[in-house]
């Protein structure tokens, strides 16, 4: 069973001092931040017992294994059902505490009732403040039964539940009609899934015979021991004021466990601590009684004395629950109450015994749960004891259960039962997860869900190149850390598998399913440098670069050009997808902008080192287009252009540029500068006769401006082929004067 205890402090004079504490003795309990241990939860359960809302309760965590609920302001805050949930996975367990108001009309004679399947349960509500109305019994908040107030017997209302079955379990209440629900008596009924003394799926297995009020768990056959007792059969008493499955916890405060109610996992329920009784667990046991709720009687023999916490304290020469066994009778010594082995191992189990006459090898035997008897293979005889060693055949799951070591001599016999847990080594249910990859390493998360039993002690990661027959490489890692597989080959698929281990011999589980993880391409190592660049317009830049010459093939898929506009905080990236390219035209840039430019080689998704940066200033955008451009043929080789200056100029024009192109021609256009910006007319000379030309022009201030409209004109016929167009310009007025 899960080592989980819910403690209720029942010093009820002041509700503000009331607290509930949930304590877990489980390894790693309550950490909650990792995959191996969900947190402890402690809360009031309002589904069945609803009380008036009050201020929210305060939850405080004390370390990883303890959580406390405080902040109760009035007695009614306490009434109802509280639950603590702890343990991980299939072991997740809920412990329930039911609190009754001490001032209620009806009070339970006993709050927790644990009964076996098929038993008759009797719930008894004692009249504390009488009302002459019906008494309504409810089960889990729903109507169950009605009693007339005359039906009280000796001041008690009884609810008989014959032949109870597990679904009958739950919270029961008895309430006077017309009374507040806070005046109810609340009970908890726990129905074990098996008849008395049995456990297991078909209730075929025999319980170990739990001592000192321990209750046999119907699922796993373990004894859930009352607070203050430990051992497989609860045979051992803890020191006063201690509790927990290994007596590892201590009651808070100077008065020990007085005034505390202890609730343990079902089917135990709740009780006072060992040595205490009463509705508020504040009364010490009467002489001759001991244990939780003082339910046990000592009946010590041979001069033994009764201790209310542990039972009979025997004088020397005697032992046993009632000091009924003489020390001459053989006695099993120091047998562990619980042993754990891994499936399919062949462990050695030791059993030591003493007595008079002295036990010999053949007088000690080991009995398995299926009744098979093993004889010892060797014995070590020492002055005070004989230790027999048993070689156990290969363990199977059915070997889980209670084993027994038995010693028999002419002086009598003794036996000690102990629990053997056969654990299944863990097997991953999923493949590991790739977190990041580089060309020569993979970062892997090995944490995966698994079948079988924990805890996980080690994680092995096995890996090798895909389709390889070479041996697997193995790395052993901490369960909670990510793993880096190093010194791998670039651009290579690796098969990766996880193997989990639990503690103990044979704890290694089978390998989990494989997954394919591929390393990245090799990083490009060459650093380009910028050869040069020139501006081809206010928004166009031609860039060229080079790479160092190295032997072998080029490692790269292309180039990335980056332009950084520091003023606007914007980056422009241009992908050149050929590794042979050494030049690129960048268009759509912002005129008048200062750019920082660099280039780097890329391969797959990896970037090589960037070139040293260059700083480029694009000219600002130029002036508007000239207006009313007009062309007029003057001869077979001359055409005159006239225009009007652009409007709204941002500054003085430095020149005009005229573009001349043969209509329908395939060649590049010719650009001719008009260097006297004040002119509004120019003559283009050296043209071919009878040829149709296209003209457009633009102005320049610091940068070139927008083109004007395009005009067409043909030279006059029958002239000779000219050398090529040239320009002569005058002010328009001057031309008109001539």
């Amino acid at each position: 069973a899960v080592d989980l205890t819910l403690l209720a402090n029942l010093r009820l004079t002041d509700p503000q001092r009331f607290f509930l504490t949930c304590v877990s003795g489980e390894a790693g309990a309550g950490r909650g931040s990792d995959a191996w241990g969900p947190p402890l939860l402690l809360e009031k359960d309002d589904r069945i017992v609803r009380t008036p809302p009050g201020p929210p309760l305060r939850l405080a965590r004390n370390g990883s294994h303890q959580v406390t609920l405080r902040g109760f302001s009035k007695p009614s805050d306490l009434v109802g059902v509280f639950s603590c949930v702890g343990g991980a996975g299939a072991r997740r367990t809920r412990v329930i505490y039911v609190h009754n108001s001490p001032g209620a009309h009806l009070l339970p004679d006993k709050v927790t009732h644990t009964v076996n399947k098929g038993d008759t349960a009797v719930l008894s509500a004692r009249v504390h403040k009488e009302k002459q109305t019906d008494v309504i019994w409810k089960s889990n908040g729903s109507y169950f039964y009605t009693l007339d107030w005359h039906e009280a017997q000796d001041g008690r209302f009884l609810l008989q539940l014959p032949n109870v079955q597990p679904p009958s379990s739950g919270i029961y209440s008895a309430t006077y009609l017309e009374a507040s629900p806070l005046g109810s008596a609340f009970f908890r009924l726990i129905v074990r899934g098996c008849g008395a003394g049995r456990w297991g799926p078909g209730c075929t297995k025999e319980c170990p015979g739990c001592l000192h009020g321990g209750v046999c768990h119907d699922h796993d056959g373990e004894c859930v021991c009352p607070p203050g007792f430990t051992g497989t059969r609860c045979e051992q008493a803890c020191r006063e004021g201690r509790f927990g499955q290994s007596c590892q916890e201590q009651c808070p405060g100077i008065s020990g466990c007085r005034g505390l109610t202890f609730c343990l996992p079902d089917p135990y329920g709740c009780s006072c601590g060992s040595g205490w009784r009463g509705s508020q667990c504040q009364e010490a046991c009467a002489p001759g009684h001991f244990g939780a709720d003082c339910r046990l009687q000592c009946q010590c023999q041979n001069g033994g004395t009764c201790d209310r916490f542990s039972g009979c304290v025997c004088p020397s020469g005697w032992h046993g629950v009632h000091c009924e066994k003489s020390d001459r009778i053989p006695q099993i010594l120091n047998m562990a109450s619980e042993l754990e082995f891994n499936l399919e191992t062949m462990p050695r189990i030791n059993c030591a015994a003493a007595g008079n006459p002295f036990p010999v090898r053949g007088s000690i035997e080991l009995r398995k749960p299926d009744g098979t008897v093993l004889l010892s293979t060797k014995a070590i005889v020492e002055p005070e004891k004989t230790t027999a060693e048993f070689e156990v055949p290969r363990l199977v799951l059915a070997d889980s259960g209670f084993w027994e070591c038995r010693v028999s001599t002419s002086g009598g016999q003794d036996s000690r039962r102990f629990k053997v847990n056969v654990k299944v080594p863990p097997v991953p249910l999923a493949a590991p997860r790739l977190l990041t990859k580089q060309s020569r390493q993979l970062v892997v998360s090995p944490l995966v869900s698994f079948s079988g039993d924990g805890p996980i002690s080690t994680v092995r990661l096995h890996y090798r190149p895909q389709d390889s027959t070479m041996d697997w490489s193995t790395i052993v890692v901490d369960p909670s850390e990510n793993v880096t597989l190093m010194n791998l080959r670039p651009k290579t698929g690796y098969s990766v598998r996880v193997q989990l281990s639990r503690p103990g011999e044979g704890g290694e589980g089978a390998w989990g399913p494989p997954t394919l993880m591929t390393t990245d391409c090799p990083e490009p190592l060459l650093q380009p440098w910028l050869e040069g660049w020139h501006v081809e317009g206010t928004d166009r830049l031609r860039v060229s670069w080079s790479l160092p010459l190295v032997p072998g093939p080029l490692v790269g898929d292309g180039f990335l050009l980056r332009l950084w506009d520091g003023t606007r905080g914007q980056e422009r990236r241009e992908n050149v997808s050929s590794p042979q390219a050494r030049t690129a035209l960048l268009t759509g840039l912002t005129p008048g902008t200062h750019y920082q430019l660099d280039v780097q080689l890329y391969h797959c998704t990896l970037l090589g080192p960037a070139s040293p940066p260059a700083h480029v200033l694009l000219p600002p955008s130029g002036p508007p287009a000239p207006r009313h451009l007009h062309a007029q043929a003057l001869s077979d080789s001359e055409i005159q252009l006239t225009w009007k200056h652009p409007e709204a100029l941002p500054g003085p024009i430095s020149k005009y540029v005229v573009e001349v192109q043969v209509a329908g021609g395939a060649g590049d256009p010719l650009w001719i500068d008009v260097d006297r910006p004040e002119e509004t007319s120019t003559i283009i000379r050296g043209l071919n006769a009878s040829t149709r030309y296209l003209f457009r022009m633009r102005a320049s201030i610091q940068g070139l401006g927008d083109w004007s409209n395009t005009v067409e004109e043909s030279t006059l016929g029958n002239g000779l082929q000219a050398e090529g167009p040239v320009q002569e310009s005058r002010a328009a007025e001057e031309g008109l004067d001539q």
């Epitope: 309504i136 109507y143 039964y145 007339d148 005359h150 009609l177 017309e178 507040s180």
Partner: antibody, heavy 121, light 107 residues
Framework: EVQLLESGGGLVQPGGSLRLSCAAS????????MFWVRQAPGKGLEWVSV????????MYADSVKGRFTISRDNSKNTLYLQMNSLRAEDTAVYYC??????????????????WGQGTLV | DIQMTQSPSSLSASVGDRVTITCRAS??????LNWYQQKPGKAPKLLIY???SLQSGVPSRFSGSGSGTDFTLTISSLQPEDFATYYC?????????FGQGTKVEIK
């Protein structure tokens, strides 16, 4: 499905006797209070008697006290009303009904949630 | 015994009307009051318990209110199937007395 089925009604002379039965099904009969309620022709409803689940405590309207006896057989899921010394004013349709209790605003309230179809006496 | 008095004894109303029936107890009964509907030749049917809690399956046009000695059953919009006799009943003490009934007829 909860069902209550009365039987045993009929014509009887004043001073005569009659035993009504109410067969219950669809619920755990032994856990509920059971009631007899009657309705004279053209009149309103009149509470007659109640019996607790255990069969112990019983109560009667003053008009029938000493003449009528309510009883139950939990093993047969049946409620009975033995009527002796019948009078003309006992003429009515007799209904059996189940007593239920439900919580509302924290308190428990009783009511009659299922009724039989009635039998005429 | 606690006497329960309903008013009116009968009323005529049309479909869609809002109808109110009152019930008065001869002594305080807190909220221990139930309302039943009965149609001719049929058994009574529980509508409301605890003065104002609607029994499951009962249309929401039925509502109850009141506490102490004075209680009301309201039908917000009368439907053709609502023409019946309505009874209040106290469940505060034994005997569990009923009101004399209110017959709701078609106008």
């Amino acid at each position: 499905e909860v069902q209550l089925l009365e039987s045993g009604g009929g014509l009887v002379q004043p001073g005569g006797s009659l035993r009504l039965s109410c067969a219950a099904s669809g619920f755990t009969f032994s856990r509920y209070k059971m009631f007899w309620v009657r309705q004279a022709p053209g009149k309103g409803l009149e509470w007659v008697s109640v019996i607790y689940p255990s069969g112990g405590p019983t109560m009667y309207a003053d008009s029938v006290k000493g003449r009528f006896t309510i009883s139950r057989d939990n093993s047969k899921n049946t409620l009975y009303l033995q009527m002796n010394s019948l009078r003309a004013e006992d003429t009515a349709v007799y209904y059996c009904a189940r007593g239920m209790v439900r919580g509302y605003s924290g308190y428990d309230y009783p009511f009659l949630d299922y009724w039989g179809q009635g039998t005429l006496v | 015994d606690i006497q329960m008095t309903q008013s009116p004894s009968s009323l005529s109303a049309s479909v869609g009307d809002r109808v109110t029936i009152t019930c008065r107890a001869s002594q305080t009964i807190s909220s221990y009051l139930n309302w039943y509907q009965q149609k001719p030749g049929k058994a009574p049917k529980l509508l409301i318990y605890a003065a104002s809690s609607l029994q499951s399956g009962v249309p929401s046009r039925f509502s109850g209110s009141g506490s102490g000695t004075d209680f009301t059953l309201t039908i917000s919009s009368l439907q053709p199937e609502d023409f019946a006799t309505y009874y209040c009943q106290q469940s505060y003490s034994t005997p569990r007395t009923f009101g004399q009934g209110t017959k709701v007829e078609i106008k």
